[in-house]
Amino acid sequence: TQNKALPENIKYGIVLDAGSSHTSLYIYKWPAEKENDTGVVHQVEECRVKGPGISKYVQKVNEIGIYLTDCMERAREVIPRSQHQETPVYLGATAGMRLLRMESEELADRVLDVVERSLSNYPFDFQGARIITGQEEGAYGWITINYLLGKFSQKTRWFSIVPYETNNQETFGALDLGGASTQITFVPQNQTTESPDNALQFRLYGKDYNVYTHSFLCYGKDQALWQKLAKDIQVASNEILRDPCFHPGYKKVVNVSDLYKTPCTKRFEMTLPFQQFEIQGIGNYQQCHQSVLELFNTSYCPYSQCAFNGIFLPPLQGDFGAFSAFYFVMNFLNLTSEKVSQEKVTEMMKKFCSQPWEEIKTSYAGVKEKYLSEYCFSGTYILSLLLQGYHFTADSWEHIHFIGKIQGSDAGWTLGYMLNLTNMIPAEQPLSTPLSHSTYV
């Protein structure tokens, strides 16, 4: 008789990333008997929830159930019914909810309570919704990319899984940019740290890792823009803000109450003689860059070396994967290629920002104007953050790899979070079994 493959025992997991600007649901699958192997879990689906981030539902919590319906129903379709009850569901909320909690624990709790109630109505094994710490967000992002790059595997391969994988086991650093925060995580050369708050120790697959991580709350691209506007309106002579970070000819009215809604602008808050002001774009990269730099306080550092705002940062080491909004923005601007130097990126940004708004709208007719209008700022902000904030140089720029997916799985904290919560990253190297799940009988 012909050999027949044994049916694979497949497991699934769901993680919802409740970010500041939107929520995404990720479905992961893996062969059950290979749970402790490295690199076996992969993403089968991403479903982007329609609407803003959950923190924006504070005034309309009754709409949260409907908000989550489409993606949860999609999960119901993708995952075989027989697996529903044993499929764990986790929701992690990030900086948008950290900011809401900073303003009011009650409001943050209320949103999470309604989210939990909504997710409990599905046939999956709901494991809870919580606000993850900035440290966790950084650490899980680092775990995700290194897991997907095969950095934790002890087996050396003669082939490369992904373009930027080198055969050495040196881990990649992780650069994550969201709407409300940004994280930097890497293994520094020196094991000792001057700042215990930024130090993490892991033992993964039999190896010890001493990791540096920091999450800069309010330095995600959206909150950084609010900060910049709040800073610049302080010195405006009237209710018109001529802004170099927006294309020439661009105009937008901003409510002062919206500007001061977030704790991120608290340091710039002042009584203004108007309730609204108008942004008028002048599209000048250099001036925009200068304005962005004012958000980074580099004059004070209680350590041997700092990033900005007095936060310790050890010397950069090795290659870095830059994902989430780092990738989305740079990909839109067509600047993710390994061959594009930092000087070239700056040149392209100068050109892009100076293009008239009408021209930009015509060239990118399919892109929502709200997003389209902010790419000049976001691109400039990314350059400023990486170069002046994190101290990358024209030379070390080539060590930054803008990554969207690795082997079909999105780079981000969600996979690392699930691997940790399902105990799928063993501290010790698993003993290799003689037969794999695809053994023939």
Epitope: V58, E103, S104, E106, L217
Partner: antibody, heavy 116, light 111 residues
Framework: QVQLVQSGAEVKKPGASVKVSCKAS????????MHWVRQAPGQRLEWIGY????????TFNQKFKGRATITVDTSASTAYMELSSLRSEDTAVYYC?????????WGQGTLVTVSS | DIVMTQSPDSLAVSLGERATINCKAS??????????MYWFQQKPGQPPKLLIY???NQGSGVPDRFSGSGSGTDFTLTISSLQAEDVAVYYC?????????FGGGTKVEIK
């Protein structure tokens, strides 16, 4: 576990200034606001103001505006409240409390006595 | 400013009996479906301890005999069965609007 430890008691002359410190531990200092509340002998609790440790922005009770200053040293996870132009009615126990709107954790209190 | 008026000023209750304290706000302290109302217990020489948040939720480690109710402007703290260790001053507080304000306090004693 969350802890807020305040500096020791102070005796000040009228017209002088006092600076009280509050050292936080057991949580990410920049994730929560820090409030200051005082209680004069036999009186109700009185809210002074708060700071956003993340960026140093602060909000005050109008009654203390111009006289109270709240600052932070994030590297030391410490908040400070300075009250200037002291008068005898400022004699009170001064507390720091962590929270957005929920004051779940309080310092042990610092007695400030204003006397000539 | 929102004025918080507590009643009574003091209260003497027998051990094991129910104690009820009221707090009235000069305007509603509700927002987005949440009551920004809190109850604290303070013993001599100690900082206040959070008992109730959001009008009716128990603070962590707070015994079940403490409960809160109410919404809008009228709120109540109830101690279902008074224990000797409950002798203290109780304060209500609102954080709906700056300046955050406290009630004048209610002294609870054993009868």
């Amino acid at each position: 576990q969350v802890q807020l430890v305040q500096s020791g008691a102070e005796v000040k002359k009228p017209g002088a200034s006092v600076k009280v410190s509050c050292k936080a531990s057991g949580y990410t200092f920049t994730d929560y606001n820090m409030h200051w509340v005082r209680q004069a002998p036999g009186q109700r609790l009185e809210w002074i103001g708060y700071i956003v440790p993340l960026n140093g922005g602060s909000t005050f009770n109008q009654k203390f505006k111009g006289r109270a200053t709240i600052t932070v040293d994030t590297s030391a996870s410490t908040a400070y409240m300075e009250l200037s132009s002291l008068r005898s009615e400022d004699t009170a126990v001064y507390y720091c409390a962590r929270g957005g709107t929920r004051f779940a954790y309080w310092g042990q209190g610092t007695l400030v006595t204003v006397s000539s | 400013d929102i004025v918080m008026t507590q009643s009574p000023d003091s209260l003497a209750v027998s051990l094991g009996e129910r104690a009820t304290i009221n707090c009235k706000a000069s305007e509603s302290v509700d927002n987005f479906g949440v009551s920004f109302m809190y109850w604290f217990q303070q013993k001599p020489g100690q900082p206040p301890k959070l008992l109730i948040y959001g009008a009716s939720n128990q603070g962590s480690g707070v015994p079940d005999r403490f409960s809160g109710s109410g919404s809008g402007t009228d709120f109540t703290l109830t101690i279902s069965s008074l224990q000797a260790e409950d002798v203290a001053v109780y304060y209500c507080q609102q954080t709906k609007e700056v300046p955050y304000t406290f009630g004048g306090g209610t002294k609870v004693e054993i009868k």
